[in-house]
């Protein structure tokens, strides 16, 4: 029978008695930076080339005995998970191993840096097909390790890393915190976050997605035919490296941004029990479990978007938080969220020739998050149209006035500390969906984009009585690009996108009372690209 | 690999050289910063990654490393260049006393310095 982890990542159409998806990643080379490995193990023999790279610290303690099987344990298992004959994800992928972890599973930032440099030099000397680098290790936050990962990613390499086994915010660890790296948390057979001893998988906004990482059967270095169960975010990362190899083998031209968006898109959504995570991390942690795409081709027509949360701004009065998209992505909308509800909104602004999403804290606030909606939109030309606070009591309005530009997101930001208290809601005039509406004291920002075949529509869901959460989702075939709350509801904590659903959060109902001000309206902007759909049909 | 297994090699005491003239002052208004792991048990003091500014060439990296050795020698400190980085990030890995950090941060082309730290299998 199929091991639970392989079944979990396999779409139903591939599920047979044996895990045998088409094309096993044969065009892709996966680099593994880990312990030494047992390359003659039946699972990986002929699939893994051991490079001569070794940079490891001495083992701790005078009583440590180097046992070959222990030294090779972690790396052998992971190589098996990526490409093993029986229990591997991408059975056709070839691998190269670099030893950066000693027999105790310990390495150094500097050794890892030299390893990454070795990969870059190898890539320059002998360019091959797509490269995936698996980093099944973690240390404390490291500026230099993150910088090296960024450089390698910008050279076209896909880096996949373990979120860490510290039951902590992954942003406190490297390379997990590097934005360019695909960071993977671990779930178990029940789709629950993995507990390991007293700790468990890391979580938070620096995690891109989760994957199977508990009780994973793979090659054991105890003997050339042995298997063993291992657990951890390394095992989870190895699954994603295998899935990435499969995707890149099917579409070798995929960029890192495209690959990440596809990994997110094809993941199982909302299956993880979030109660395991600390309360303040639940909204920041993606509820996604990795899976292979149902077919190797034909995903290109879709408009892919993902949600990127900023770091917390901190509580000072003028504190701001910034969320950024990857270089190949377009920022299509910007929203903000504050647990205390005290915020001064958000705005899209240019920074280094690229749009970013900036959220503003308010006096007495505990801090804010900026939430960027980052999308893949080829040949896009996007700009922000701003309307300063209006004089009229009707509120502030802004629309996309350029020919062929469509509205993809609305943001509003204000200078007054407590906008909206004792003010009636401002309603959107019907029949004018291509505009953003806000308080008269607020600046309103419309994200307007022109791209071949791009069409968008506004969808609203209003609830007259106060409720902690109001949602509105885009229907099949449409992608959520913008998420905001209609103004006038003073108790709104903020808005953010979760997959294809716009979520507007309000203060605890018990504290707000059920006045007319309790009305909450979630506004979603849903888009699709006819151009991408046509291009995909022409290919097929 | 360059000097990776230098367990038995002596740390080179760099003698005063013409390299050790007046150090080029770092660009006006930019100060190199020092970083270290927030988790104390994972710190590896005594080994530092000196990261140079983005467009620094390999020859400049080597020259900066030699300058550090020379200036350290003048102060009676042993240093050892374990690796010179190029290809991903310009810079070098150096084994030295933490007392020399202030000196190293003032070297030309230096962007920041990070103390080495441990990473672990997950």
């Amino acid at each position: 029978s199929i091991p639970w982890n392989l079944e979990r990542i396999t779409p139903p159409r591939y599920r047979a008695d044996e895990y045998q998806p088409p094309d096993g990643g044969s065009l892709v080379e996966v680099y593994l930076l880990d312990t030494s490995i047992q390359s003659d193990h039946r699972e990986i023999e002929g699939r893994v080339m051991v490079t001569d790279f070794e940079n490891v610290p001495e083992e701790d303690g005078t009583r440590f005995h180097r046992q070959a099987s222990k030294c090779d344990s972690h790396g052998t298992h992971l190589a098996g998970v990526v490409s093993g004959r029986d229990a591997g994800v991408a059975k056709g992928a070839s691998m190269r191993s670099l030893r950066v972890l000693n027999c105790q599973g310990k390495g150094t930032v500097s050794g890892t840096l030299i390893g990454l440099e070795f990969i870059r030099k190898s890539q320059l000397v002998q360019p091959v097909g797509p490269l995936v680098v698996l980093l099944p290790l973690a240390g404390g936050y490291s500026r230099v390790l993150n910088a090296a990962c960024q450089r390698l990613a910008r050279a076209g390499v896909v880096l996949v890393t373990a979120a860490g086994n510290f039951r902590d915010d992954a942003c406190l660890y490297s390379p997990a915190s590097a934005p360019e790296v695909i960071t993977v948390g671990a779930t178990n057979a029940q789709d629950q976050p993995v507990t390991l001893g007293t700790l468990g998988t890391n979580f938070g906004r620096c995690v891109d997605l989760f994957a199977p990482g508990e009780d994973i059967i793979g090659a054991s270095s105890d003997c050339s035919t042995c298997f063993v169960s291992q657990s951890g975010t390394s095992q989870a990362a190895a699954h994603v490296a295998g899935i990435a190899a499969m995707m890149l083998s099917a579409e070798p031209e995929l960029t890192l941004a495209e690959l990440r968006q596809r990994l997110i898109h094809f993941s199982a959504k909302d299956v993880i029990n979030e109660a395991w995570f600390p309360e303040d991390q639940r909204v920041l942690t993606p509820n996604l479990v990795a899976a292979l795409p149902p077919s190797t081709h034909g995903a290109g027509w879709q408009l892919f978007c993902r949600t990127v949360w900023s770091a917390h701004s901190g509580p000072t009065r003028m504190a701001t938080a910034v969320a950024r998209c990857a270089p190949d992505e377009e920022l299509l909308s910007c929203s903000s969220f504050s647990r205390s509800g005290k915020r001064r909104g958000e705005r899209m602004e240019a920074q280094g020739g690229k749009l970013v999403c900036r959220a503003h804290n308010a006096f007495g606030g505990e801090g804010v998050y900026a939430i960027a909606r980052c999308c893949l939109l080829p040949q896009a030309n996007c700009s922000v149209h701003t309307a300063p606070p209006a004089e009229a009591s009707m509120g502030t309005r802004v629309h996309c006035h350029q020919q062929g530009h469509v509205l993809t997101g609305c943001s509003s930001h204000w200078e007054v500390e407590d906008l909206g208290t004792h003010k009636p809601p401002v309603l959107r005039p019907r029949g004018q969906p291509n505009q953003c509406v806000g308080h008269r004291e607020a600046s309103i920002h419309a994200s307007c984009c022109h791209a071949p075949g791009l069409e968008c529509k506004v969808k609203e869901h209003g609830i007259p009585a106060p409720q902690e959460q109001v949602t509105v989702a885009c229907e099949e075939g449409w992608t959520l690009t913008g998420c905001s709350a209609l103004p006038g509801t003073s108790h709104v904590l903020g808005a953010y996108a979760v997959d294809n659903t716009c979520v507007v959060r309000s203060r605890d109902v018990s504290t707000t009372g059920s006045t007319s001000e309790g009305a909450v309206t979630a506004v979603a902007i849903c888009c699709r690209s006819r151009h991408l759909a046509q291009a995909s049909q022409e290919l097929q | 690999q360059e000097d990776e297994d230098g367990d038995y090699e002596e740390l080179v005491l760099a003698l005063r050289s013409e390299e050790d003239g007046l150090a080029e002052a770092p660009e006006h208004g930019t100060t190199a910063t020092f970083h270290r792991c927030a988790k104390d048990p994972w710190r590896l003091p005594g080994t530092y990654v000196v990261v140079l500014k983005e467009e620094t060439h390999l020859s400049q990296s080597e020259r900066t490393a030699r300058r550090l050795q020379a200036q350290a020698a003048r102060r009676g400190y042993l240093t050892k260049i374990l690796h010179v980085f190029h290809g991903l990030l310009p810079g070098f890995l150096v084994k030295m006393s933490g007392d020399l950090l202030e000196l190293a941060l003032k070297l030309p082309h230096v962007d920041y310095i990070e103390e080495d730290s441990s990473v672990f299998a997950q």
């Epitope: 009780d215 059967i217 | 672990f120």
Partner: antibody, heavy 130, light 107 residues
Framework: EVQLVESGGGLVQPGGSLRLSCAAS????????MSWVRQAPGKGLEWVAN????????YYVDSVKGRFTISRDIAKNSLYLQMNSLRAEDTAVYYC???????????????????????WGQGTTVTVSS | DIQMTQSPSTLSASVGDRVTITCRAS??????LAWYQQKPGKAPKLLIY???SLESGVPSRFSGSGSGTEFTLTISSLQPDDFATYYC?????????FGQGTKLEIK
């Protein structure tokens, strides 16, 4: 689905020997530690012995040390218990069980996380009597 | 060797009752404790591992708690299928010991 089937039980005289076998179906047999557990008539459970995946480590309850030997054959997906110098108090139903556990790493190194005996055989009866 | 002591030895209860079985270890075993259910003539079945983690497929009315030397198994609302003998088991350095068992019978 992993299944365990014990065999080899029977009636034996005190001082005699018996070899119990446990046949496993399912790929995961070789991936876990395995145990033998016994239950004397009308009594509770008693753990007897266990063995690592590759057979390199074995542990026994004090009362059987030097008399019983646990072994496994990965190629045959089988677990064995060789019982020598049998005594009346060894009379029991003998179960083989899979010790579900997993290895993981943290900053302290390699660790073992134990879940428990999650798959059991139906048992085989051993009677030691003259 | 670590001894495990279960109490009570026998427990009479009715369907719908909330019942608690206690297990004490002779020395600290951290959270390395499992609970099993056994019905006459059948092999034991794993219910709880690591003191409080519910094994897959086990009804949520079963729960475990405790650490160190004191552990409890609780059945929140007894069902007819729950009348059986329950055993605790400690894991310590690859060798195990079971408690003597608690027989849960219909009142």
């Amino acid at each position: 689905e992993v299944q365990l089937v014990e065999s080899g039980g029977g009636l034996v005289q005190p001082g005699g020997s018996l070899r119990l076998s446990c046949a496993a179906s399912g790929i995961t047999f070789s991936s876990y530690w395995m145990s033998w557990v016994r239950q004397a008539p009308g009594k509770g459970l008693e753990w007897v012995a266990n063995i690592k995946q590759d057979g390199s480590e074995k542990y026994y309850v004090d009362s059987v040390k030097g008399r019983f030997t646990i072994s496994r054959d990965i190629a045959k997906n089988s677990l064995y218990l060789q019982m020598n110098s049998l005594r009346a108090e060894d009379t029991a139903v003998y179960y083989c069980a899979r010790d579900r556990g997993t290895y993981y790493y943290d900053s302290g190194g390699y660790n073992y996380y134990y879940y428990g005996m999650d798959v059991w055989g139906q048992g085989t009866t051993v009677t030691v009597s003259s | 060797d670590i001894q495990m002591t279960q109490s009570p030895s026998t427990l009479s209860a009715s369907v719908g009752d909330r019942v608690t079985i206690t297990c004490r270890a002779s020395q600290s075993i951290s959270s390395w404790l499992a609970w099993y259910q056994q019905k006459p003539g059948k092999a034991p079945k794993l219910l709880i591992y690591k003191a409080s983690s519910l094994e897959s497929g086990v009804p949520s009315r079963f729960s475990g708690s405790g650490s160190g030397t004191e552990f409890t198994l609780t059945i929140s609302s007894l069902q007819p299928d729950d009348f059986a003998t329950y055993y605790c088991q400690q894991y310590n350095s690859y060798s195990y010991t079971f408690g003597q068992g608690t027989k849960l019978e219909i009142k």
